[in-house]
Amino acid sequence: HGTELPSPPSVWFEAEFFHHILHWTPIPNQSESTCYEVALLRYGIESWNSISNCSQTLSYDLTAVTLDLYHSNGYRARVRAVDGSRHSNWTVTNTRFSVDEVTLTVGSVNLEIHNGFILGKIQLPRPKMAPANDTYESIFSHFREYEIAIRKVPGNFTFTHKKVKHENFSLLTSGEVGEFCVQVKPSVASRSNKGMWSKEECISLTRQYFTVTN
């Protein structure tokens, strides 16, 4: 009776910097007692390691057991359904989980106004789970880039986009006043990682911020 249950239809990772979450879709017609077993394989150590015997959620945080992701060849994970003494076949992630699968984010964006410029500072992510030496800037040490989108409300434009190659940027507002809202999306030019837009940060610019120079 070992394989009567259907397998989870799909299993995949969704990861940000030191936030590595495994997801799966539920089996059809699961019962209240159905749970899921999770196992992990590290490339180079060709044996599966059981991580959770009975998870009743449809995701599992694997950050703690994949802390060496950024210095390894990556991982595969597998999930199977369990219901009492019955269990399904395993469903395995269909791609290797490596640093390339990590979606890049920023920690926050700080804005200030100085002499008619909007000055922005991008704070890099500092996850609590990350080992002390594994900072964003040490792991992605070269070719960090950021796409910056600014919209003005109200105004005669929806947005302006700029790609910058460092964590500071400045926009000359040229006498425009109003509320400026900024979002940032990180990337690394030498890598294929996806980036995620940050939440919008806004700042108001009024006439008082402009100084007259002769």
């Epitope: 003005k152 302006t160 700029k162 790609k163 926009l171 000359l172 425009e176």
Partner: nanobody
Framework: ELQLVESGGGLVQAGGSLRLSCANS????????VGWFRQAPGKEREFVAA????????YFGDFVEGRFSISRDSAKNTLYLEMNKLKPEDTAVYYC????????????????????WGKGTPVTVSS
């Protein structure tokens, strides 16, 4: 001196697409911000989109709503405006313009920042 000549305008049905080109037969655009403005009959000229020639900054008017994209081909010294999901209210004469400098500045949303202009290409969107 920059010499700008637009092409690619014409009649298109609502929901259709057009690609406008702006060829520069003068010296290179290299240190410029180049863009598109439009003027509908009886209305003021308005900003559509702009791009720094190095490609790292783009600007779009509020009506664009993701329907238009701006690009340039350095080898051909040509600017493009790809217009999709066109609406009757997009009917206008579209002008190519160039401004000296590539600083990231909201000045490039203003007509007065552009020193060089083409003669325009008409776009008519029928319903």
């Amino acid at each position: 001196e920059l010499q700008l000549v637009e092409s690619g305008g014409g009649l298109v049905q609502a929901g259709g697409s057009l690609r406008l080109s702006c060829a520069n037969s003068g010296r290179t655009f290299s240190s410029h911000t180049v863009g598109w403005f439009r003027q509908a009959p009886g209305k003021e000229r308005e900003f559509v989109a702009a791009i720094t020639w190095n490609g790292d900054t783009t600007y779009f008017g509020d009506f664009v709503e993701g329907r238009f994209s701006i690009s340039r081909d350095s080898a051909k010294n040509t600017l493009y405006l790809e217009m999709n999901k066109l609406k009757p209210e997009d009917t206008a004469v579209y002008y190519c313009a160039a401004a000296t400098g590539q600083v990231w500045s909201l000045q490039y949303l203003r007509e007065s920042s552009y020193a060089y202009w083409g003669k325009g290409t008409p776009v008519t969107v029928s319903s």
